[in-house]
């Protein structure tokens, strides 16, 4: 039969979790077509390209899990949703909250 | 497809008022931050005002501040800059833009209105 | 706030010939930097995004790099459609959004 393919359309960022430093956080990715289903490789834009050492990929669910995020998780993060005819992408800036100082009296 | 289209510019004497729209079509309009820029006559672009999602965190521009009101209506996919008290070096094309992430880079412009401030 | 110098302001160039601007933060903006083109009459056009990433659609000829302060945007070989305004634009401290004072590429 006629198998009809439609590239990924523009996918949705979003943060799961708190920001705060030491917390663990998940980046999904996600179009809402696609045919072939879409894969999703996330990337830190930045000079390297590289997700933070901590950080671990799943390219079929369109997510990836930042462990114990530091100030240098912080940036911009790009998700590509790809397949044999297209590719898509959105963005996502996570930026880690550090503690404020306490004031003790 | 992504479209922005912008509206009611025109002529209007200094210390006159002028309220602009942005009809924003092909997307979630609520999912995204929005952004007023403008450029004068022969000049560089200027960020005048820009507004989240949602329409509950609004920023301005040190030289409209005061004067200038950015708000949106959600349900009508609708950007809107109301201008008071207007300057002769307020005359420029005003654009509307979409942020693709947070107040980040602008990956979508509407065509411009022109605003002009003289008595 | 944080300001964005823009050089050359103006540049007369050949077609084919390797065109670079480039653009210096006045602190430290990581890598939240990104340039338009604008032609006479229209509105800005992004090309790059976070200092280094093309835009979908954008040609390859165009790049960019940079990080900290310092940024540059090349274009390998110039093509006529080429010849516009290129603005750089800071995202890293905003709102507020603020802009170079842009570079025209002129036909020499």
């Known amino acids: 039969g006629l198998t009809v393919l439609v590239p990924p359309s523009a996918p949705h960022c979003q943060i799961q979790g708190s920001q705060d430093i030491g917390s663990d956080v998940i980046l999904l990715c996600s179009s809402e077509e696609g045919i072939p289903r879409p894969t999703y490789l996330w990337e830190k834009l930045d000079n390297t390209l590289k997700l933070p050492p901590t950080a671990t990929q799943d390219q079929v669910q369109g997510t990836v899990t930042i462990r114990n995020i530091s100030a240098l998780s912080s940036g911009l993060y790009q998700c590509v949703a790809s397949n044999a005819i297209g590719t898509s992408t959105c963005l996502l800036d996570l930026q880690v909250i550090s503690p404020q100082p306490r004031n003790i009296g | 497809e992504v479209q922005l289209l912008e509206s009611g510019g025109g002529l209007v004497q200094p210390g006159g008022s002028l309220r602009l729209s942005c009809a924003a079509s092909?997307?979630?309009?609520?999912?995204?931050?929005m952004s007023w820029v403008r450029q004068a006559p022969g000049k560089g672009l200027e960020w005048v005002s820009a507004?989240?999602?949602?329409?509950?965190?609004?920023y301005y521009a040190d030289s409209v501040k005061g004067r200038f009101t950015i708000s949106r209506d959600n349900s009508k996919n609708t950007l809107y800059l109301q201008m008071n008290s207007l300057r002769a070096e307020d005359t420029a094309v005003y654009y509307c833009?979409?942020?693709?992430?947070?107040?980040?880079?602008?990956?979508?412009w509407g065509q411009g209105t022109l605003v002009t401030v003289s008595s | 706030d944080i300001q964005m110098t823009q050089s050359p302001s103006s540049l007369s160039a050949s077609v084919g010939d390797r065109v670079t601007i480039t653009c210096r933060a006045s602190?430290?903006?990581?890598?939240?930097l990104n340039w338009y083109q604008q032609k006479p009459g229209k509105a800005p056009k992004l090309l790059i995004y976070?200092?280094?990433s093309l835009q979908s659609g954008v040609p390859s000829r165009f790049s960019g790099s940079g990080s900290g302060t310092d940024f540059t945007l090349t274009i390998s070989s110039l093509q006529p459609e080429d010849f516009a305004t290129y603005y750089c634009?800071?995202?890293?401290?905003?709102?507020?959004?603020?802009f170079g004072q842009g570079t025209k590429v002129e036909i020499k």
């Open positions: 976070a200092a280094s």
């Open positions: 602190q430290s903006i990581s890598s939240y």
């Open positions: 507004i989240s999602g949602s329409g509950g965190s609004t």
């Open positions: 634009q800071q995202s890293h401290q905003s709102p507020p959004i603020t």
């Open positions: 833009a979409r942020h693709w992430v947070s107040y980040g880079p602008f990956d979508y």
């Open positions: 092909g997307f979630t309009f609520s999912s995204y931050a």
